[in-house]
């Protein structure tokens, strides 16, 4: 194996030694340690945990471990003036109020500083009005309401169920529809799996459980007050009116017991179809307003949260490379949680901790990786990926010149069914080869490889005998590295069976019930899935940092570029007349993809044959591989999204969590039939095809022989 060939390596110190050192029992202990109290970003508790991790990483043997602090905009509820929603009668009396906080889980009754459920960065306000039910508040849901049902949300309070898309997109859509407030709730259809008990007897959401979360639309900006630059001691901060991505209307989340009380009285239009009905015993009427007997009653929101510039702390650990210390492989995951963080993020942080410990053990025995490995414990991820983004902004010049790869390490599990991987196509072969070498933890796959169980349970929709690997979207700390800086990135975790469990994420996501016990009792009692994820994440880092030739295969990029070009062309071809009228051609894009394919193929041949003992040629070939992802970056960024600069991938404009391919073209084509100026709209499509074709061609040329 290539990893055996790294400098200063003894036969003992190979990938196997690293993997064998990883222990499930340690991950379990670390998870317990990280989840006993809340670690909300900006709090003293989270600062103390940062210092603890710094100290332990030093003990584990890293060369240096530093805290990197920033002063960023965060959001907290008012401790003496709680947020809630009420139903008021015609006299203005509150006849129903939503919960002020979640009932605490067993054993945590006396824990202080549990932040009550709130929508981070909601403005203050006390709007009152009629309710409109907007399903998931997706773009298509508002199209259905406004265009088909002719329901006007202007001046209304909308109630939307969580799920399907990032909550910030829901709020943005509601704002654009003219709503004056948003209520978010968890419907049992999405957060209560049939046949499973609610916590503490199972992993389902109790009626009083509520999902917290930020509702920003940052589009990769990081701290809302310092877009593009680090929020350091001498930062110039925007005024709050100019801050990036803040919502303009009050927003608040509730559980399904409280949602029942709001939805059961709804009148107005019936739901348009069954896809608008959840699992509550309510009609799911759209409104506006309450039905006959209750028509004089209104809904009132009481939101008193405040935005505050607060200090946050990243922990950055360094294991210096022996041969190429100026090449960085980064493993990062966040440390801050909404409450206890049993899954998000501490199931990931515990895995990172054990990976650091294993690397440290090898280093203490005289080994070093070929390239430098950076380990990061990010702060304020839950408030908009702030810690990772500020650090990357501060170190952008180093990262764009030296960044080989970024491996993300948030939640290690969101289920216990099979592996889930999202990564750049450059890492497909690395992931395939690695998982073929790892044992599957799955029942019924004893003695079989992880690759085999993963492929069986989550087959690729395109290639038989291969597992599904998804596009990177956003909503996690890889965003700045991949979407802004063009550093090859990947993430891996254990997931649920998406076919049989249609609920969104996992039921207890961002609730007070995300505890150590949730993981230890229901998800992974033996911590075998955590161990497998540690092996995948750690194995990827090991190989990226240690292999003589970077384990990137540019031919896999060629394959997906063709697939993405075909897909976007077929979307455009839904408008054949307009394509003809406005002379829209995809020839340049297909030509560029063809060129990329041929050049990538020739590069791969040269990669097999070159003299690996020549350090200059080796470095040159590795640099071409490292900078390929960078070549897909457009310095001007995407329209209205300057920090999303990757031309091949961006978070969907309709769902931050999802990745979109050729996003510039996709967005230009989206809903084009409704544009008031079709000539201008199709002109933008043509411009985006031009940008994409140029970028693919330019990237291809970085793989050509240098002279």
């Amino acid at each position: 194996k290539s990893s055996n060939e790294a400098t200063n390596i003894t036969p003992k110190h190979n990938m196997k030694a690293f993997l064998d050192e990883l222990k499930a029992e340690n991950i379990k202990k670390f998870l317990y340690n990280f989840t006993q109290i809340p670690h909300l970003a900006g709090t003293e508790q989270n600062f103390q945990l940062a210092k603890q991790i710094q100290s332990q990483w030093k003990e584990f043997g890293l060369d240096s471990v530093e805290l990197a602090h920033y002063d960023v905009l965060l959001s907290y509820p008012n401790k003496t003036h709680p947020n809630y929603i009420s139903i008021i009668n015609e006299d203005g009396n509150e006849i129903f109020n939503t919960s002020l906080f979640e009932p605490p889980p067993p054993g945590y009754e006396n824990v202080s500083d549990i932040v009550p459920p709130f929508s981070a960065f909601s403005p203050q306000g006390m709007p009152e009005g009629d309710l409109v039910y907007v399903n998931y508040a997706r773009t298509e849901d508002f199209f259905k309401l406004e265009r088909d049902m002719k329901i006007n949300c202007s001046g209304k309070i909308v109630i939307a169920r969580y799920g399907k898309v990032f909550r910030g997109n829901k709020v943005k859509n509601a704002q654009l529809a003219g709503a004056k407030g948003v209520i978010l709730y968890s419907d049992p259809a999405d957060y209560f799996a049939p046949g499973v008990k609610s916590y503490p007897d199972g992993w389902n959401l109790p009626g009083g459980g509520v999902q917290r979360g930020n509702i920003l639309n940052l589009n990769g900006a990081g701290d809302p007050l310092t877009p593009g630059y680090p929020a350091n001691e001498y930062a110039y901060r925007r005024g709050i009116a100019e801050a990036v991505g803040l919502p303009s209307i009050p927003v608040h989340p509730i559980g399904y017991y409280d949602a029942q009380k709001l939805l059961e009285k709804m009148g107005g239009s019936a739901p348009p179809d069954s896809s608008w009905r959840g699992s509550l015993k309510v009609p799911y009427n759209v409104g506006p307003g309450f039905t006959g007997n209750f028509s004089t009653q209104k809904v009132k929101m009481h939101i008193h949260s405040t935005n505050e510039v607060t200090r946050i702390y990243n922990v950055i650990g360094t294991l210096r490379g022996a041969v190429e210390p100026d090449r960085y492989v980064i493993l990062g995951g966040h440390r801050d949680s909404w409450v206890f963080g049993g899954i998000d993020p501490q199931s990931g942080a515990a895995v990172v901790h054990e990976i650091v410990r294993s690397f440290g053990t090898l280093k203490k025995e005289g080994w070093r990786p070929r390239r430098t490995i950076l380990f990061a414990s990010w702060d304020a991820e839950e408030f908009g990926l702030l810690g990772s983004t500020e650090w990357a902004e501060e170190n952008s010049r180093l990262l764009q010149e030296r960044g080989v790869a970024y491996i993300n390490a948030d939640s290690s599990i969101e289920g216990n069914y099979t592996l889930r991987v999202d990564c750049t196509p450059l890492m497909y072969s690395l992931v395939h080869n690695l998982t073929k070498e790892l044992k599957s933890p799955d029942e019924g796959f004893e003695g079989k490889s992880l690759y085999e169980s993963w492929t069986k349970k989550s087959p690729s929709p395109e290639f038989s005998g291969m597992p599904r690997i998804s596009k990177l979207g956003s909503g996690n700390d890889f965003e700045v590295f991949f979407q802004r800086l063009g550093i090859a990135s990947g993430r891996a975790r254990y997931t649920k069976n998406w076919e049989t469990n249609k609920f969104s994420g996992y039921p207890l996501y961002h609730s007070v019930y995300e505890t150590y016990e949730l993981v230890e009792k229901f998800y992974d009692p033996m911590f075998k899935y955590h161990l497998t994820v540690a092996q995948v994440r750690g194995g990827m880092v090991f190989e990226l940092a240690n292999s003589i030739v970077l384990p990137f295969d540019c031919r896999d990029y060629a394959v997906v570029l063709r697939k993405y070009a075909d897909k976007i062309y077929s979307i455009s071809m839904k408008h054949p007349q307009e394509m003809k009228t406005y002379s829209v051609s995809f020839d340049s894009l297909f030509s560029a993809v063809k060129n990329f394919t041929e050049i990538a193929s020739k590069f791969s041949e040269r990669l097999q044959d070159f003299d690996k003992s020549n350090p200059i040629v080796l470095r040159m070939m590795n640099d071409q591989l490292m900078f390929l992802e960078r070549a897909f970056i457009d310095p001007l960024g995407l329209p209205d999204r300057p920090f999303y600069r990757h031309v091949i991938y961006a978070p969907s404009s309709h769902n931050k969590y999802a990745g979109e391919s050729f996003p510039g073209i996709y967005d230009a084509l989206f809903d084009i039939e409704s544009k008031v100026d079709p000539s201008k709209a199709w002109g933008e499509v043509k411009r985006q095809i031009y940008v994409a074709a140029f970028t693919v061609q330019a990237a291809a040329e970085t793989l050509s022989e240098v002279a």
Partner: antibody, heavy 111, light 107 residues
């Protein structure tokens, strides 16, 4: 019809033990928590503890640790509470009551 | 433990009247307060849970309100069968605790 049928009154000597029963009918026994509540003559109510037949978990009010022991027989859908080292302080009415979940109020009571 | 103070402990009223019973918690219990009715020879009856949610089968003349630490049970247009003992109970934090009770008698 949902019913919780409790055993009758008991006369016991100080220092002895007593085991009372609560037979459930009209619902799936293992789907609900079974709570026990004490009421001194003409006084208020005091929660003793619960038994969850779904996973055999128990939880006790600290005031009753060592005093009360909660068990169930799933085959007969019956809950039991044993009180030991009895004193005059233990003379009271004892009720069983069910709840849908850990956080839900007690919707049906024995008598 | 959460202490629950119930008042008044005794209340006399006439059929047709509206009465209120109050409960105060020693700390915020959000909205997780239940109200029970106790009658001699009958099983206790859950009237309201989660502060204001009427249990199915309970007449709408019973209503609950409040949040945080202060809660109220209101019975409007008292019926003869409403004269009984009433207890409140917090169901957010174990050990569950009860108010001292209110005896509602016919004036």
């Amino acid at each position: 019809e949902i019913q919780l049928q409790q055993s009758g009154p008991e006369l016991v000597k100080p220092g002895a033990s007593v085991k009372m029963s609560c037979k459930a009918s009209g619902y799936t026994f293992t789907d609900y928590y079974m709570h026990w509540v004490k009421q001194n003559n003409g006084e208020s109510l005091e929660w003793i503890g619960y038994f969850n037949p779904y996973n055999d978990y128990t939880r006790y009010n600290q005031n009753f640790n060592g005093k009360a022991t909660l068990t169930v027989d799933k085959s007969s859908s019956t809950a039991y509470m044993q009180l030991n080292s009895l004193t005059s302080e233990d003379s009271a009415f004892y009720y069983c009551a069910r709840s849908d979940g850990y956080y839900d109020a007690m919707d049906y009571w024995g008598q | 433990d959460v202490q629950i103070t119930q008042s008044p402990s005794y209340l006399a009223a006439s059929p047709g009247e509206t009465i209120t019973i109050n409960c105060r918690a020693s700390k915020s219990i959000s909205k997780y307060l239940a109200w029970y009715q106790e009658k001699p020879g009958k099983a206790n009856k859950l009237l309201i849970h989660s502060g204001s949610t009427l249990q199915s089968g309970i007449p709408s003349r019973f209503s609950g309100s409040g949040s945080g630490t202060d809660f109220t049970l209101t019975i409007s247009s008292l019926e003869p069968e409403d004269f009984a003992m009433y207890y409140c109970q917090q169901h957010i934090e174990y050990p569950w605790t009860f108010g001292g009770g209110t005896k509602l008698e016919i004036k």
